[in-house]
C-alpha cells in the first residue's frame, strides 16, 4: 500500500500521523524481516520491530550504534601485563612458553610466532585483533594488516569435501574440478594451468625443522598446508639457473645454543655443519584466489605475520622455525 | 614408530656423578622439546629438566639446578642427563619423555621412554 | 610453583562402574593440563592434553574436563585394564607439576 510519496514493503500499513504519512507492520510474521539482512555486527543480536528500519540490535559490549558498528573503549581496562621476570628469563630462547605467548609478553620474544614480535604491527583497528581470533566476524579486524580477521568473515568452516583425495591429487598437473575450490586449494593450480600467474610481491623466506631432501618430497603437502592457511598457493621459488631455492639451514647461532654446545666436550666446530632444516623461498600466486575472494595478499608482508598468527596459535602443521617477508631479489645467505 | 630407551642408570655414591642417555628413533629429534622425568620408589612423578634440541633451550626443576646438566647431539638423536652431586634424595627411575608440540614446551609428553633405574646409596 | 591437587589419592571401583578422578591447580593454568596412566613396572602413558582432548589410541571411555584451576577425568565404564594409577600435571608455567595420583583398585 501507499500513502503520497511514502511506498510501503510487502505486509505494511499506510499510517497518517501527525508527522506525515508512515509505514507501519501490523504483523511482523507477514512483513520482509530487518533482520533478513544480518544488520548486526559484531556479535550483536537482532530483533524484528514494526516500524523501519524494521529491526533493533542489542550489542554486545564493547559496541554500539544502530548496527553495533561503534567501538567503544572500555573506560578503564587495565593494559595487559606480562609475568615480568619470568618471561623475560624465558624470551627469546628459541622455545615457546605458553605463560609467555601474549602480545605483552611479545608472544614470547618471538618464540611463539616465527621470530615476528608482533605480527599485528601495521593494524591499525581500534580493537585489539589479536585478541579477537574467536570463531566469529569482526569486521574492524577484517582488513589485511590486520591478517582479515584470522579469515572468521568469509565461512572460515568450510572444509574440502575430499580432503584425502584433493590432498593426494594436489598440484599434480591433472584438473580435478572436485578440488578446484579455495578449500580444497583450488587443486594446486591445476586447473588454471592456462592462466596467467598473479604473483603478489615480495618472497616468504621460512625455516622449516625438515632437512631439505625432506621437504622437496613433501613439498605438494607443505605448500597445501600453508596455501589452507593464507588462502590462496604458494610455490617454490626458482633462482635464476632455474633451481628450486631450497637450502640447507645449520641452525641459529643463538646465545643458548652456544651455551648448550660448551656444556657438551664436543670438538672445535663439531655440530656447526650439521643439518638443522630447510632455508626456503616461497612465492604467491594469486590467480585464483582474486577470482573468488577480495581477501588476497597482494605482498608477502602480512602473509608472513598470518603465518605466525597461527604459529601463536598452534595451528601450524609443519615445525616452521621463522618467516620472514623479502621484498627485494634474496641473495643465497644463511 | 616413535621410540625412546634410556640407559646409564645404576648405583652410585652419595656426592657422585652419572650420565643418563635417551636414544630417539622414528621422528626428527630436533624438531621436539625433551623431558626427564623421575618416580622415587613408591612415590609419584617429578618433573626433571628439558631442552629443546634445535635451540638448546634448557629449563630445571629447582631440585636439581646447579647439579644436573641436559644436553642434546642432534647428530646422534640422544638427549643426555649429567647428574652430579648426587644425593639419596636423587634415587629414582628416570624416564626420558618426549613433547608432543615442535617448539612448545607448553605440550604434553606423549611418548615416554621404559625408565633406568638410579640408586644413590652409600 | 603451581600445586596440583588430586582427588581421592585412591578408590575402590568394580568393572563397569564410572569413575570421577578431580584435579585442582593452586592458580590458573588455563587448559594446559595433562593425564597420564601409569602400570606398575611401566611407564606413564598420555591419556588427555589440553585438558580434554583424548591422545591416540585413548579409547573414548576416557574424558577429561575443566579449565583454570578444577579439572577431572572422567572413565564412563571402569574396564579391568583401566586399574592403575592416574595423575595430573599442568605445562603451563615451568616447572611443570603433577598431582599425587590416585590409585583406581578393584573392589
Known amino acids: 500500500s501507499s500513502c503520497g510519496q511514502v511506498k510501503c514493503r510487502k505486509g505494511e500499513q499506510c499510517v497518517h500521523t501527525a508527522s506525515g504519512p508512515r509505514c507501519f507492520c501490523p504483523s511482523p510474521r507477514d512483513c520482509e524481516s530487518g533482520c533478513a539482512s544480518s544488520p548486526c555486527q559484531h556479535g550483536g543480536s537482532c530483533h524484528p520491530q514494526r516500524q523501519p528500519p524494521y529491526y533493533s540490535c542489542q550489542c554486545a559490549p564493547p559496541f554500539s550504534g544502530s548496527r553495533c558498528e561503534l567501538y567503544t573503549a572500555p573506560p578503564s581496562t587495565p593494559p595487559a601485563t606480562c609475568l615480568s621476570q619470568y618471561c623475560a628469563d624465558k624470551a627469546r630462547d628459541g622455545v615457546c612458553d605458553e605463560a609467555c605467548n601474549s602480545h605483552a609478553c611479545q608472544w614470547d620474544g618471538g618464540d611463539c610466532s616465527l621470530t615476528m614480535e608482533n605480527p599485528w604491527a601495521n593494524c591499525s583497528s581500534p580493537l585489539p585483533c589479536w585478541d579477537y581470533i574467536n570463531n566469529q566476524c569482526d569486521e574492524l579486524c577484517n582488513t589485511v594488516e590486520c591478517l582479515f580477521d584470522n579469515f572468521e568473515c568469509q565461512g572460515n568452516s568450510k572444509t574440502c569435501k575430499y580432503d584425502k583425495y584433493c590432498a593426494d591429487h594436489f598440484k599434480d598437473n591433472h584438473c580435478d574440478q572436485g578440488c578446484n575450490s579455495e578449500e580444497c586449494g583450488w587443486d594446486g593450480l591445476d586447473c588454471a594451468a592456462d592462466q596467467p600467474e598473479n604473483l603478489a610481491e615480495g618472497t616468504l623466506v621460512i625455516v622449516v625443522l625438515m632437512p631439505p631432501e625432506q621437504l622437496l618430497q613433501d613439498a605438494r603437502s607443505f605448500l597445501r598446508a600453508l596455501g589452507t592457511l593464507l588462502h590462496t598457493n604458494l610455490r617454490i621459488k626458482r633462482d635464476s639457473q632455474g633451481e628450486l631455492m631450497v637450502y640447507p639451514y645449520y641452525g641459529e647461532k643463538s646465545a643458548a645454543m652456544k651455551k648448550q654446545r660448551m656444556t657438551r666436550r664436543s670438538l672445535p666446530g663439531e655440530q656447526e655443519q650439521e643439518v638443522a632444516g630447510s632455508k626456503v623461498f616461497l612465492e604467491i600466486d594469486n590467480r585464483q584466489c582474486v577470482q573468488d575472494s577480495d581477501h588476497c595478499f597482494k605482498n608477502t608482508d602480512a602473509a608472513a605475520a598470518l603465518l605466525a598468527s597461527h604459529a601463536i596459535q598452534g595451528t601450524l602443521s609443519y615445525p616452521l622455525v621463522s618467516v620472514v617477508s623479502e621484498s627485494l631479489t634474496p641473495e643465497r645467505t644463511q | 614408530e616413535v621410540q625412546l630407551v634410556e640407559s646409564g642408570g645404576g648405583l652410585v655414591q652419595p656426592g657422585g656423578s652419572l650420565r643418563l642417555s635417551c636414544a630417539a628413533s622414528g621422528y626428527t629429534f630436533s624438531s621436539y622439546g625433551m623431558s626427564w622425568v623421575r618416580q622415587a620408589p613408591g612415590k609419584g612423578l617429578e618433573w626433571v629438566s628439558y631442552i629443546y634440541p634445535y635451540s638448546g633451550a634448557t629449563y630445571y626443576a629447582d631440585s636439581v639446578k646447579g647439579r644436573f646438566t641436559i644436553s642434546a647431539d642432534t647428530s646422534k638423536n640422544t638427549a643426555y642427563l649429567q647428574m652430579n652431586s648426587l644425593r639419596a634424595e636423587d634415587t629414582a627411575v628416570y624416564y626420558c619423555?618426549?613433547?608432543?608440540?615442535?617448539?612448545?614446551?607448553?605440550?604434553?609428553?606423549?611418548?615416554w621412554g621404559q625408565g633406568t633405574l638410579v640408586t644413590v646409596s652409600a | 610453583d603451581i600445586q596440583m591437587t588430586q582427588s581421592p589419592s585412591s578408590l575402590s571401583a568394580s568393572v563397569g562402574d564410572r569413575v570421577t578422578i578431580t584435579c585442582r591447580a593452586s592458580q590458573s593454568v588455563r587448559s594446559f593440563l595433562a593425564w597420564y596412566q601409569q602400570k606398575p613396572g611401566k611407564a606413564p602413558k598420555l591419556l588427555i592434553y589440553?585438558?580434554?582432548i583424548r591422545a591416540s589410541g585413548v579409547p573414548s571411555r576416557f574424558s577429561g574436563s575443566g579449565s583454570g584451576t578444577d579439572f577431572t577425568l572422567t572413565i564412563s565404564s571402569l574396564q579391568p585394564e583401566d586399574f592403575a594409577t592416574y595423575y595430573c600435571q599442568q605445562y603451563y608455567i615451568s616447572p611443570w607439576t603433577f598431582g599425587q595420583g590416585t590409585k583406581v583398585e578393584i573392589k
Open positions: 589440553r585438558a580434554s
Open positions: 619423555a618426549r613433547h608432543s608440540g615442535y617448539y612448545r614446551i607448553s605440550s604434553a609428553m606423549d611418548v
